[in-house]
């Protein structure tokens, strides 16, 4: 009778084991072990027992002890079970960004690992088990479908293998894949709202605002604003699930014409874009030309208004005849025209909008000086010792200086309150002088003496 010990062994892959082969007869003709494994016999006293060290056990094996005794030949097998954890536990690669509401298939692949009967594959979200299945096939593959939710954002998905050898008196061996961090997002189907001027004047600044609601996570949204080839640099303000991107846009003469304004919102692996056209125009204020801005009374003055070739002008409210970019009027300058404003209003149609520009010039009419009876009476009669204010107003542009002198030496205090004395009596020559000339007027002051009864 041949026996083997141990009859069953579980050992790690590449491990060694001592196997004892025994026989019941005292003087066996043969006693040995049959195995493809590397073996080494340990020397023991006696003939009916042999111990072998079997090494580098890579796979399950059934070494067989045999003996040849006088009463016949017999055999006994030992069962070697090799265990090893999987060489590869991997989640199939997925885009890190996933839209909310999408069915996401998680696929775990497991290569190697034994004994397979004791090997289980577990799919997890964080620590929560989503699916547990025995490892079947090579490579073993376990899949599960997850409906992506907003609260999955930032969640870690992983795959774990469990080699449970506790029934064999060993432990539970776990291997975990690299985690896959899910980034969930919501990008609404509605395009971003773009608010901007439809027309923009050269050498001015405009404000462009791009906004969108219903985004998640809003802080991860990228906003790209551009006018033609010009990238704009917006200031972005975030709400709970919305953003507003505000940018200043400056345009030059090189940008003139129709330009495309784009606002693109990129979130996850999706984008939404809004396009708008902006017409960039050049429209200088009309030019008001006076033959001379300062003229003497009686001078003929031509007032011209010139504007953009496509503009229509009105000069002092009167449209150009024929309607167009030029208007003019002729006048003979009078004192009443001094300070008169000549206003030219130009209108240009740009992309269906009417743009208005104005320019005003003032005419200065030099005239005078003037001294007349109404403003400078020729005769004053005042009672002696009374308080009087001599009034004499000279007119003209520039405003004339006025002096009233008696005998070329005694001034009459114009506009001042004076006590009437005999010295004040006499004829004064009032002279009004300006760059336009000089006029004189005689003013007589009579002083009435008090009557004595």
């Amino acid at each position: 009778q041949t026996s083997v010990s141990p009859s069953k062994v579980i050992l790690p892959r590449g491990g060694s084991v001592l196997v004892t082969c025994s026989t019941s007869c005292d003087q066996p003709k043969l006693l040995g072990i049959e195995t493809p494994l590397p073996k080494k016999e340990l020397l023991l006293p006696g003939n009916n027992r042999k111990v072998y060290e079997l090494s580098n056990v890579q796979e399950d094996s059934q070494p067989m002890c045999y003996s040849n005794c006088p009463d016949g030949q017999s055999t006994a097998k030992t069962f070697l079970t090799v265990y090893w954890t999987p060489e590869r536990v991997e989640l199939a690669p997925l885009p890190s960004w996933q839209p909310v509401g999408k069915n996401l298939t998680l696929r775990c692949q497991v290569e190697g690992g034994a004994p397979r009967a004791n090997l289980t594959v577990v799919l997890l979200r964080g620590e929560k088990e989503l699916k547990r299945e025995p490892a079947v096939g090579e490579p073993a593959e376990v899949t599960t479908t997850v409906l992506v939710r907003r609260d999955h954002h930032g969640a870690n998905f992983s795959c774990r293998t469990e080699l449970d050898l506790r029934p064999q008196g060993l432990e539970l061996f776990e291997n975990t894949s690299a985690p896959y961090q899910l980034q969930t997002f919501v990008l609404p189907a509605t395009p971003p709202q773009l608010v901007s001027p439809r027309v923009l004047e050269v050498d001015t600044q405009g404000t462009v605002v791009c906004s969108l609601d219903g985004l998640f996570p809003v802080s991860e949204a990228q906003v790209h604003l551009a006018l033609g080839d010009q990238r704009l640099n917006p200031t972005v303000t975030y709400g709970n699930d919305s953003f507003s991107a505000k940018a200043s846009v400056s345009v030059t003469a090189e940008d003139e014409g129709t330009q495309r304004l784009t606002c693109a919102v990129i979130l996850g692996n999706q984008s939404q874009e809004t396009l708008q056209t902006v017409t960039i125009y050049s429209f200088p204020a009309p030019n008001v030309i006076l033959t001379k801005p300062e003229v003497s009374e009686g001078t003929e003055v031509t007032v011209k208004c010139e504007a953009h070739p496509r503009a229509k002008v009105t000069l002092n409210g009167v449209p150009a005849q024929p309607l167009g970019p030029r208007a003019q009027l002729l006048l003979k300058a009078t004192p009443e025209d001094n300070g008169r404003s000549f206003s030219c209003s130009a209108t240009l149609e740009v992309a269906g909008q009417l743009i208005h520009k104005n320019q005003t010039r003032e005419l200065r009419v030099l005239y005078g000086p003037r001294l007349d009876e109404r403003d400078c009476p020729g005769n004053w009669t005042w009672p002696e010792n009374s308080q009087q204010t001599p009034m004499c107003q000279a007119w003209g542009n520039p405003l004339p200086e006025l002096k009233c002198l008696k005998d070329g030496t005694f001034p009459l205090p114009i506009g001042e309150s004076v006590t009437v004395t005999r010295d004040l009596e006499g004829t004064y020559l009032c002279r009004a002088r300006s760059t336009q000339g000089e006029v004189t007027r005689k003013v007589t002051v009579n002083v009435l003496s008090p009557r004595y009864e």
Partner: antibody
């Protein structure tokens, strides 16, 4: 327009002296002319004025000591009886009471009178 | 009598500084006050008339003010060329006068 004094010289006390102011570029019938003097190292002193009508007006201290008269183009200042205190530069001035901004009041260069025995 | 009293008799001022000269009339001369600048050996130069009006060619750093009996000449941003004697003159009455001019103020620029 200009004014220029002449006649200033060394005289002995009590010897009458007449200074003449010659004007050009304006009419004495429409402008008053005055006389101002300045003793060496001293301030300006108003003597008197002749109006466009020919009337004369004097400083209180000058009455009786000076006489102002005019022709169509000249104005005279007569020192009736000079004393050593009358040693000064005498200026002829147009319009001392009638000034416009551009009528840079006209002063002559002055003429020096020295009264000494 | 219409006479003028001027103060101070002399004043020292630094370049860039400001100087104020005052004149008082013995009775109201309204706004008929003129100011002159005189440098040694030269005839007086007309600066201001009617109390505050600048004669042509006079820099705006010269400013006249006042009416009635109190008048002021202010020179701001003083320049070395402004060193001179300044006189006020009443230009209201040519009779009843002792002296139509103030006594003068000598302005020395440091």
């Amino acid at each position: 327009q200009s004014v220029e004094e002449s006649g200033g010289r060394l005289v002995t006390p009590g010897t009458p002296l007449t200074l003449t102011c010659t004007v050009s570029g304006f009419s004495l019938s429409s402008h008053a002319m005055g006389w101002v003097r300045q003793a060496p190292g001293k301030g300006l002193q108003y003597i008197g004025i002749i109006g466009s009508s020919g009337s004369t007006y004097y400083a209180s201290w000058a009455k009786g000591r000076f006489t102002i008269s005019k022709t169509s183009t000249t104005v005279d200042l007569r020192l009736t009886s000079p004393t050593t205190e009358d040693t000064a530069t005498y200026f002829c001035v147009r319009d001392p009471y009638d000034s416009f901004g551009d009528a840079y009041r006209l002063w002559g260069p002055g003429t020096l009178v020295t009264v000494s025995s | 009598a219409y006479d003028m009293t001027q103060t101070p008799a002399s004043v020292e001022v630094a370049v860039g500084g400001t100087v104020t000269i005052k004149c008082q009339a013995s009775q109201s001369i309204y706004s008929y006050c003129s100011w002159y600048q005189q440098k040694p050996g030269q005839r007086p130069k007309f600066l201001i008339y009617d109390a505050s009006k600048l004669a042509s060619g006079v820099p705006s750093r010269f400013k006249g003010s006042g009416s009635g009996t109190e008048f002021t000449l202010t020179i701001s941003g003083m320049q070395s060329d402004d060193a001179a004697t300044y006189y006020c003159q009443q230009a209201y009455s040519s009779s009843n006068v002792d002296n139509a001019f103030g006594g003068g103020t000598e302005v020395v620029v440091k």
